[in-house]
Interface confidence: low
């Protein structure tokens, strides 16, 4: 089966790479605009230049195109703790990231929030903090992992999952209580 192509894809596929079909005259292939520019006017005829204009400040195109407008530059989301890694240029969008010792938590494909990497206090680093993943901690004896923080077993309630990890400590506490009630 031949995959269904959208109208624009169909039109583009008629022309060689780097060119697109004239929207008013399908016998003409116009040269696409370079990245950093956009289409101002289609080429008037075969072998004639496409009228491409440079993107204005605050906009960009990152690849060759025949867009009628440049794309607006992204803004780093301060409320998400994001910082600007590199500013927007005519041919590249803003690059946003996190500060040192922080990782990105993605809420969706395009939305991330910056959080401080866990320090693994009362534990050891099992896996170091990475760009998109928090540190993975292993807790010392007498501590259990809760939201990537090593918490004392004295805070472990019987209803929680930590009872398995803190079982020896809980039994010891029980034992001392029992021995005092003879």
């Amino acid at each position: 089966l031949v995959p269904h192509l959208g109208d624009r894809e169909k039109r583009d596929s008629v022309c060689p790479q780097g060119k697109y079909i004239h929207p008013q005259n399908n016998s003409i292939c116009c040269t696409k605009c370079h990245k950093g520019t956009y289409l101002y006017n289609d080429c008037p005829g075969p072998g004639q230049d496409t009228d491409c204009r440079e993107c204005e400040s605050g906009s960009f195109t990152a690849s060759e195109n025949h867009l009628r407008h440049c794309l607006s530059c992204s803004k780093c989301r301060k409320e998400m703790g994001q910082v600007e890694i590199s500013s927007c240029t005519v041919d590249r969008d803003t690059v946003c990231g996190c500060r040192k010792n922080q990782y990105r938590h993605y809420w969706s494909e395009n939305l991330f929030q910056c959080f401080n990497c866990s320090l693994c206090l009362n534990g050891t680093v099992h896996l170091s903090c990475q760009e998109k993943q928090n540190t993975v901690c292993t807790c010392h004896a007498g501590f259990f992992l809760r939201e990537n923080e090593c918490v004392s077993c004295s805070n472990c309630k019987k209803s929680l999952e930590c009872t398995k990890l803190c079982l020896p400590q809980i039994e010891n506490v029980k034992g001392t209580e029992d021995s005092g009630t003879t």
């Epitope: 409320e79 703790g81 938590h105 910056c114 959080f115 401080n116 928090n134 939201e147 990537n148 923080e149």
Partner: nanobody
């Protein structure tokens, strides 16, 4: 002790409205950006909306933009989420949360309030 208490959830018909509230205590409310996160049955957490500490900047997920409005009353230590034009896919437990920038996405949580959109 940090406490977040959500209220205002319930059963509503598609196209209807609800207003969620979150009463906060145990921390300096005015210092923190606050948010709403939801969890639909059998699904993961989904970020819904966030509001800056000073309430001058609000942010929404594309799925709720134009329908939901986040606000806060710093004098009452309360966060709100006005939900209009509700859809079946908005059915979830809604949690109010504080963004502290620490270890996990939203460090403190309320117990959540269930919103069910059904005819």
């Amino acid at each position: 002790e940090v406490q977040l208490l959500e209220s205002g959830g319930g059963l509503v018909q598609p196209g209807g409205s609800l207003r969620l509230s979150c009463a906060a205590s145990g921390f300096t409310f005015v210092k923190y950006s606050m948010g709403w996160v939801r969890q639909a049955p059998g699904k993961g957490l989904e970020w819904v909306s966030q509001i800056a500490d000073t309430a001058d900047r609000t942010y929404y997920d594309h799925s709720v933009k134009g329908r939901f409005t986040i606000s806060r009353d710093n004098s009452k230590n309360t966060l709100y989420l006005q939900m209009n034009s509700l859809r079946a896919e908005d059915t979830a437990v809604y949690y109010c949360a504080i963004y502290t920038g620490r270890w996990v996405p939203f460090e403190y949580w309320g117990q959540g309030t269930l919103v069910t959109v059904s005819s």
